[in-house]
Interface confidence: medium
């Protein structure tokens, strides 16, 4: 059982990807804190020479959907929708391999950004993955 909340996204940083859709938050005040973190991360990303175009085109919306997951509207209790594991793995191991290595070894980035761990996501063919968020 989850004990979080579903609330409309009210932020700026991810508005172009999420709009005013309902997102899952673990606490009522968490959205503002995460918004500040992702804004700082995006400021860093925007000026970073370490981020390739190939990576950025999927990494930026992925980070938004990871930070502010859509609520699972098929669930009777507030529950987040996961990123799709196959896309997460392509991002980490192919499109953004160099960037992930750099980010995971850079404490300044890790302070601002919680990167998704693909191994925590449900397997592609499992029932839990049926409603995953595709980028």
């Amino acid at each position: 059982e989850e004990d979080g909340f579903c609330q409309p996204y009210r932020g700026i940083a991810c508005a172009r990807f999420i709009g005013n859709r309902t997102v899952y938050m673990e606490s009522l005040h968490m959205q503002g804190e995460i918004e500040n973190q992702i804004t700082a991360a995006f400021t860093m990303i925007g000026t970073s020479s370490h981020l390739s175009d190939k990576c950025s085109q999927f990494a930026i919306p992925s980070l938004c959907h990871y930070a502010f997951p859509y609520c699972d509207e098929t669930s009777s209790v507030p529950k987040p929708r996961d990123l799709c594991r196959d896309e997460c793995e392509i991002l980490e191991n192919v499109l953004c391999q160099t960037e992930y290595i750099f980010a995971r070894s850079n404490p300044m980035i890790l302070m601002r950004l919680k990167l998704p761990n693909c191994e925590d996501l449900p397997q592609p063919e499992s029932p839990e993955a049926a409603n995953c968020i595709r980028i």
Epitope: I12, R16, G46, D53, S56, F58, I60, P61
Partner: antibody, heavy 121, light 107 residues
């Protein structure tokens, strides 16, 4: 060199349709927000729509919502604006423009030369 | 929707003059404001982004500033090639909005 080239403008009757194209080159098309902005004769700039080609995230101005559709073909590095149910007030030069920053929210640094759409009977 | 109210709508100035154009946002847009220059029959050109950052290749006589929801474009010493129409734009929200424009004419 970054370039955006619009095409597809012309004269169309009220209620008619037109599809504008914006061919991009010199940058990774799928990594940047692409905008359509229009300018009626003798008037100011009006933002119309944008697309994030990777994943096809889109957004529209209220004045065109439901009538215009923005799309992109990443294999051709081209953005499109399909305009249906055209009205006289849609008469304008239509520009496509690229957002400067890959993250978005940064201003439009490269613009096409514009293509004129005239809606008249 | 956020409105950007630009003033004046037009102004006459001489070469060498200091010119100031103002834009007021109807609500907070942080520093997410850009300024563009447009000449007749041409596409707009980006001058300033993030309220005060000078875009690459733009002469240093152009500058931008912010005070709350008021944004200012200043041309410190007007040059002949600066006679044009100038627009502000907010991009804080997905629906980006432009000011009405300020036409800078020769006195």
């Amino acid at each position: 060199e970054v370039q955006l080239v619009e095409s597809g403008g012309g004269l169309v009757q009220p209620g008619g349709s037109l599809r504008l194209s914006c061919a991009a080159s010199g940058f990774t098309f799928s990594s940047y927000f692409i905008h359509w902005v229009r300018q009626a004769p003798g008037k100011g700039l009006e933002w119309v729509a944008w697309i994030y080609p990777s994943g096809s995230y889109t957004y529209y101005a209220d004045s065109v919502k439901g009538r215009f559709t923005i799309s992109a073909d990443t294999s051709k590095n081209t953005a499109y604006l399909q305009m249906n149910s055209l009205r006289a007030e849609d008469t304008a030069v239509y520009y496509c423009a690229r957002e400067m920053d890959r993250v978005g929210y940064s201003g439009m640094d490269y613009w096409g030369q514009g293509t004129l759409v005239t809606v008249s009977s | 929707d956020i409105q950007m109210t630009q003033s004046p709508s037009s102004l006459s100035a001489s070469v060498g003059d200091r010119v100031t154009i103002t834009c007021r946002a109807s609500q907070s847009v942080s520093s997410a404001v850009a300024w563009y220059q447009q000449k007749p029959g041409k596409a707009p050109k980006l001058l300033i982004y993030s309220a005060s950052s000078l875009y690459s290749g733009v002469p240093s006589r152009f500058s931008g500033s912010r005070s709350g929801t008021d944004f200012t474009l200043t041309i410190s010493s007007l040059q002949p090639e600066d006679f044009a129409t100038y627009y502000c734009q907010q991009y804080r929200t997905p629906l980006g909005t432009f000011g009405q424009g300020t036409k800078v004419e020769i006195k």
